[in-house]
């Protein structure tokens, strides 16, 4: 089971209209450049077999991957949104640094790995798709962690 007290984000992190709006604007702009609408990264398959108490830990993994493998490499694109949204998401990642789960997290790692594999397989268009789903990442992170 997760060390649930550490797998929590305060509601106030998601009650900042300006950065929420910028995150959604960034997602909107990137989704216009996404020509692969058949694939969804953040959806039912990602959460399959994951209990309520494990969702935040899973989303922490997705957030960290998105930052390190997608947003940092693409940081020169989609300005001015990117330069505001990335530090915000990085702060959330930092706040979840002590979120771990005790015991087996293989099912979670397997689900996250499928997402990573999909992004990698699609190459740059996979990275654009991930940016285009930042609204879903934001909302899923909120719903899982508050």
């Amino acid at each position: 089971a997760p060390i649930s007290s550490h797998c929590r984000l305060d509601k106030s992190n998601f009650q900042q209209p300006y950065i929420t709006n910028r995150t959604f604007m960034l997602a909107k702009e990137a989704s216009l450049a996404d020509n692969n609408t058949d694939v969804r990264l953040i959806g039912e398959k990602l959460f399959h077999g994951v209990s309520m108490s494990e969702r935040c830990y899973l989303m922490k993994q997705v957030l960290n991957f998105t930052l390190e493998e997608v947003l940092f490499p693409q940081s020169d694109r989609f300005q001015p949104y990117m330069q505001e949204v990335v530090p915000f998401l990085a702060r959330l990642s930092n706040r979840l640094s002590t979120c771990h789960i005790e015991g087996d997290d293989l099912h979670i790692q397997r689900n996250v790995q499928k997402l990573k594999d999909t992004v990698k397989k699609l190459g740059e268009s996979g990275e654009i798709k991930a940016i285009g789903e930042l609204d879903l990442l934001f909302m899923s992170l909120r719903n899982a962690c508050i």
Partner: antibody, heavy 119, light 112 residues
Framework: EVQLVESGGGLVQPGGSLRLSCAVS????????MIWVRQAPGKGLEWIGI???????YYASWAKGRFTISRDSSKNTLYLQMNSLRAEDTAVYYC?????????????WGQGTLVTVSS | AVVLTQSPSSLSASVGDRVTITCQAS??????LAWYQQKPGKAPKLLIY???TLASGVPSRFSGSGSGTDFTLTISSLQPEDFATYYC??????????????FGGGTKVEIK
């Protein structure tokens, strides 16, 4: 094909008990949270409670103490135990699968089973 | 607990009409809203989630919009099979789990 079939409804006297069943096929109960929802005649939908993948249960405040959700994963069957039944518990009772996609969505639903509480 | 107020509670329309149903939440629910269709004697069926994402197999004449406290379900051109009752449903996280899921009172769409 995913299917949910409720059973166990019927006429029960006030103060009585009833156990409803929801037999599922096409997916494993151990991989999804499941909910119970009820609908009084001519009224709207009312959430009763949920059983999570790990077996944790959560109930609407009004249902706590009288209603208990459980499951038997080996039989792929969900249950709703209802005690101290009242006339106002008369309703169609539905089970539904909870698909978390970043937000909880209920899909699909069973066809429902009617519970009538009357003397 | 969040309260969802649907309006109108019922409406009469003709085949081909554009129909709009609103759902107002008593607090900010972001985009954590779904819409369900229920025909008489049948179980509810998921239409829309994330306020605007069409569920699999749902015709494109259905659309959803809104965020925060105000949401809309639109049927662009009403078909005979669309006469039913429509419910909005919210998920509220971060509070007690006993009030996480709430349904609106429903909107009955009848034949004019």
């Amino acid at each position: 094909e995913v299917q949910l079939v409720e059973s166990g409804g019927g006429l029960v006297q006030p103060g009585g008990s009833l156990r409803l069943s929801c037999a599922v096929s096409g997916f494993s109960l151990s991989s999804y949270a499941m909910i119970w929802v009820r609908q009084a005649p001519g009224k709207g939908l009312e959430w009763i409670g949920i059983i999570d993948i790990d077996g944790s249960t959560y109930y609407a405040s009004w249902a706590k103490g009288r209603f208990t959700i459980s499951r038997d994963s080996s039989k792929n069957t969900l249950y709703l135990q209802m005690n101290s039944l009242r006339a106002e518990d008369t309703a169609v009772y539905y089970c539904a699968r909870d698909r978390f996609v970043g937000v909880d969505i209920f899909d699909p639903w069973g066809q429902g089973t009617l519970v009538t509480v009357s003397s | 607990a969040v309260v969802l107020t649907q309006s109108p509670s019922s409406l009469s329309a003709s085949v081909g009409d554009r129909v709009t149903i609103t759902c107002q939440a008593s607090e900010d629910i972001y985009t954590n809203l779904a819409w369900y269709q229920q025909k008489p004697g049948k179980a509810p069926k998921l239409l829309i989630y994330w306020a605007s994402t069409l569920a699999s197999g749902v015709p494109s004449r259905f659309s959803g919009s809104g965020s925060g406290t105000d949401f809309t379900l639109t049927i662009s051109s009403l078909q005979p099979e669309d006469f039913a009752t429509y419910y909005c449903q919210a998920c509220v996280y971060g509070n007690s789990a006993d009030s996480r899921y709430t349904f609106g009172g429903g909107t009955k769409v009848e034949i004019k």
